[in-house]
């Protein structure tokens, strides 16, 4: 539980905080878990402990491993673990997923991108910011304290943003970079209610008795990532799972994202071996999200077999 993943690039500074917190007056001992060897506190060492912080100045790939910190007070000891991975610098521009910090979302009204972990370091402004490896230029971008502000955010501003700064330790400078993804929530013309594209309201679908039939419930929920959005089928106002007819099952179809940015979901209702009694049921396609629900109702009717003799 008290374990924390930390990562960095070789030849850059990396500072890791002990996952167990204590008062500043408590002593903290650091060990390299594999060898149980104590980490020195003398600052002349490349890797040294400084209270709650473990400093790699600079880091090397060989430093990767699990480090144990023990917070000691007069009445108790608390143990934490720092799982440190140091990666080789990439020659190309791509930042692999394992080097990414948490994704942040912005919109036209709020577009701050904070530089991850920067509060652990002794740095001075300004920060340098890069998007997809390109230095950011233009009046729309403002490096402010530990974050980047983007004015008039557009969908095209989504991407991977890297902050670069210098950590100073006893007069020596070390470079640090950190990257996170930025997604744009489009608030312009955003339709907040679900929109059912199929089936049509009060649609009558023709089916053949004894054959299989499929009904598709398809709805769109807005642009970008949708939280708590769902499409599902109901029979006579009851959930499929509660209705208890094994011939009738629903299965998730495609998660779609159209060129206009709309996020859509499909749910397919499969009726095996259609029976007469299925024609008496009301089939409801439901689309729900945080803002409300939509319901389109379908009924089945018997398709008359083609009379080949006439």
């Amino acid at each position: 539980k008290f374990s924390k993943q930390s990562w960095g690039l070789e030849n850059e500074a990396l500072i890791v905080r002990c996952p167990r917190q204590g008062k500043p007056s408590y002593t903290v001992d650091w060990y390299y878990s594999q060898t149980n060897k104590s980490i020195p506190t003398q600052e002349r060492n490349r890797v040294f402990a400084s209270g709650q912080l473990l400093k790699f100045l600079p880091a090397a790939v060989a430093d990767s491993g699990i480090y144990t910190c023990i917070v000691r007070s007069p009445t108790f000891n608390r143990t934490g673990y720092a799982n440190v991975t140091i990666y080789k610098k990439q020659s190309d521009c791509n930042v692999p997923d394992y080097l990414m910090y948490s994704t942040v979302s912005g919109s036209e009204k709020n577009s701050k991108i904070y530089c991850p972990t920067i509060d652990l370091y002794n740095w001075t402004a300004p920060l340098e910011w890069f998007k997809n490896c390109q230095a950011l230029q233009g009046s729309r971008y403002r490096a402010h304290k530990s974050f980047l502000v983007i004015d008039n955010v557009m969908t095209e501003d989504a991407g991977d943003y890297t902050c670069k700064f210098i950590h100073n330790e006893n007069g020596a400078n070390y470079s640090v970079t950190a990257t996170r993804s930025f997604t744009v929530k489009d608030e312009q013309g955003f339709s907040l209610f679900p929109v059912i594209g199929a089936p049509a309201q009060n649609e009558i679908k023709e089916v053949e008795i004894g054959k299989n039939a499929n009904l598709t419930c398809s709805a769109c929920f807005g642009k970008g990532t949708q939280f708590l959005a769902a499409v599902l089928w109901q029979l006579n106002g009851t959930k499929i799972t509660d209705f208890g007819e094994p011939r009738i099952q629903q299965e998730e179809g495609q998660n779609q994202s159209f060129s206009n940015g709309l996020a859509c979901l499909d749910m397919v209702l499969r009726i095996a071996d259609v029976k007469e009694e299925d024609l008496l049921l009301q089939y409801d396609c439901l689309a729900l999200n945080l803002h409300g629900l939509r319901r389109h109702t379908v009924r089945l009717s018997r398709k008359n077999p083609i009379d080949h003799h006439s």
């Epitope: 339709s191 907040l192 209610f193 929109v195 059912i196 594209g197 309201q201 769109c220 708590l228 769902a230 599902l232 109901q234 106002g237 009851t238 959930k239 509660d242 409801d284 439901l286 729900l288 999200n289 945080l290 803002h291 409300g292 629900l293 939509r294 319901r295 389109h296």
Partner: antibody, heavy 117, light 112 residues
């Protein structure tokens, strides 16, 4: 048949809270939404918020954000609307309604809440 | 929020005669799936509101067919082909296309 039965009239002091209940019957409660609408004396209808089933989330009109809490208990098929920091202008009839899917097809009988010192 | 404007605000009617109420929205209520999310409700004196028309023109089950709805986009109309005494009350339009849902201010229909 579908029915929504609301709790009785309430008289409240300014600054206090009121919790109105709405018991549903005659339909599968968990597969329909519940909306809350209020009507001040002699005034029109005002949509306050709603509860979305299955994903179990409530949504509120901006005007009431922070003051209203809408919940639902599926085991008793009952929806609740709690309004806090009451003021005299909250005196109104509060209705719950079944959200069929964008339209409110059945309504409760209404609960009169009077806020007076 | 979307503003719904009804007219007239008061409508004196004669039983057996037709009546018409207009509702205008500040933004289009027509969605990409072809539906206009606009409903009409009637609140009879001393009663809770009841749904008459949904999706601009679909008659709610159990509602007499003398009621009809029409319109698309921003302009909508509720028509009563032959008013009956029991039709008196306040009629409200409500949009459910944009968050949050909003009602018109109401049209009071009374017998002349």
């Amino acid at each position: 048949q579908v029915q929504l039965v609301q709790s009785g009239a309430e008289v409240k002091k300014p600054g206090s809270s009121v919790k109105v209940s709405c018991k549903a019957s005659g339909f599968s409660f968990s597969t329909y939404g519940v909306a809350w609408v209020r009507q001040a004396p002699g005034q029109g209808l005002e949509w306050m918020g709603g509860f979305v089933p299955i994903i179990g989330s409530a949504n509120y009109a901006q005007k009431f954000q922070g003051r209203v809490t809408i919940t639902a208990d599926e085991s008793t098929s009952t929806a609740y609307m709690e309004l806090s920091s009451l003021r005299s202008e909250d005196t109104a009839v509060y209705y719950c309604a079944r959200d069929y899917g964008g339209n409110l097809d059945y309504w409760g009988q209404g609960t009169l809440v009077t806020v007076s010192s | 929020d979307i503003v719904m404007t009804q007219s007239p605000l008061s409508l004196p009617v004669t039983p057996g005669e037709p009546a018409s109420i207009s509702c205008r929205s500040s933004q289009s209520l027509l969605h990409s799936n072809g539906y206009n999310y606009l409903d009409w409700y009637l609140q009879k004196p001393g009663q809770s509101p009841q749904l008459l028309i949904y999706a601009a023109s679909s008659l709610q089950s159990g509602v007499p067919d003398r009621f009809s709805g029409s319109g698309s986009g921003t302009d909508f109309t509720l028509k009563i082909s032959r008013v009956e005494a029991e039709d008196v009350g306040v009629y409200y339009c409500m949009q459910g296309a944009h968050w949050p849902p909003t009602f018109g201010q109401g049209t009071k229909v009374e017998i002349k």
